[in-house]
């Protein structure tokens, strides 16, 4: 297993609709054709695999399970979007990138993006 640098923004604020997007960029040492991207959440004394996708370079990301994540890839960048977030989902979201094929296997883990989620205030009742 060889190490690889992964960069991601330090902080992202989710939209009022609970959507957060960030770019995960990896310094590919070679020409990988198969890449696996996993988003981990570290918070509340837990580590959770939020979503994971494997893709062939130039193709769409295919996420596992009924994922709350979507994404696109462009070169060595992966644009990730996490939907349906609520205030309690605030936490550090870490991008993990694995170059699966061809060998050698490379692994890179980013420092994490702190995603802040603020639940929208309910609209006050109106007489009009």
């Amino acid at each position: 297993c060889k190490a690889m640098h992964v960069a991601q923004p330090a902080v992202v604020l989710a939209s009022s609709r609970g959507i957060a997007s960030f770019v995960c960029e990896y310094a590919s040492p070679g020409k990988a054709t198969e890449v696996r991207v996993t988003v981990l959440r570290q918070a509340d004394s837990q580590v959770t695999e939020v979503c994971a996708a494997t893709y062939m370079m130039g193709n769409e990301l295919t996420f596992l399970d009924d994922s709350i994540c979507t994404g696109t890839s462009s070169g060595n960048q992966v644009n990730l979007t996490i939907q349906g977030l609520r205030a309690m989902d605030t936490g550090l979201y870490i991008c993990k990138v694995e170059l699966m094929y061809p060998p050698p296997y490379y692994l890179g883990i980013g420092n994490g993006t702190q995603i802040y989620v603020i639940d929208p205030e309910p609209c006050p009742d109106s007489d009009f």
């Epitope: 959770t48 399970d65 709350i68 349906g84 309690m88 989902d89």
Partner: nanobody, 125 residues
């Protein structure tokens, strides 16, 4: 409806390994998030690990990360908790639970609809 039955608990020495099993009944097992929780007498139930419906995604409490591994076999309707490098503080009753909700960034807080009766794990020093 899902019925859950845990097994595999027992008395072990610190540093030993143990594998807990959870047998589920019900045709829709593969659509449930499965979790393991533990509870000591007089204490609150504590999240240990969870696994997504397909088994592709997992979640662990920091206290067990790297020592415990959760897995599932949807064909056999089984969930497992492989526990290694056990410590005396792992002593608890371990419960298997099922939640019919989408995977989320915090499966520990999901609403678990079904629970097993628990299996005792005792780790002596």
């Amino acid at each position: 409806e899902v019925q859950l039955v845990e097994s595999g608990g027992g008395l072990v020495q610190a540093g030993d390994s143990l594998r807990l099993s959870c047998a589920a009944s019900g045709r829709t097992f593969s659509s449930y998030i499965m979790g393991w929780f533990r509870q000591a007498p007089g204490k609150e139930r504590e999240f240990v690990a969870a696994i997504s419906s397909s088994g592709a995604l997992t979640s662990y409490a920091d206290s067990v990360k790297g020592r415990f591994t959760i897995s599932r076999d949807n064909a056999e309707k089984m969930v497992y908790l492989q526990m290694s490098s056990l410590k005396p503080e792992d002593t608890d009753v371990y419960y298997c639970a099922a939640a019919r909700v989408p995977w989320s960034p915090r499966p520990s807080l999901s609403t678990y609809d079904y629970w097993g009766q628990g299996t005792q794990v005792t780790v002596s020093s």
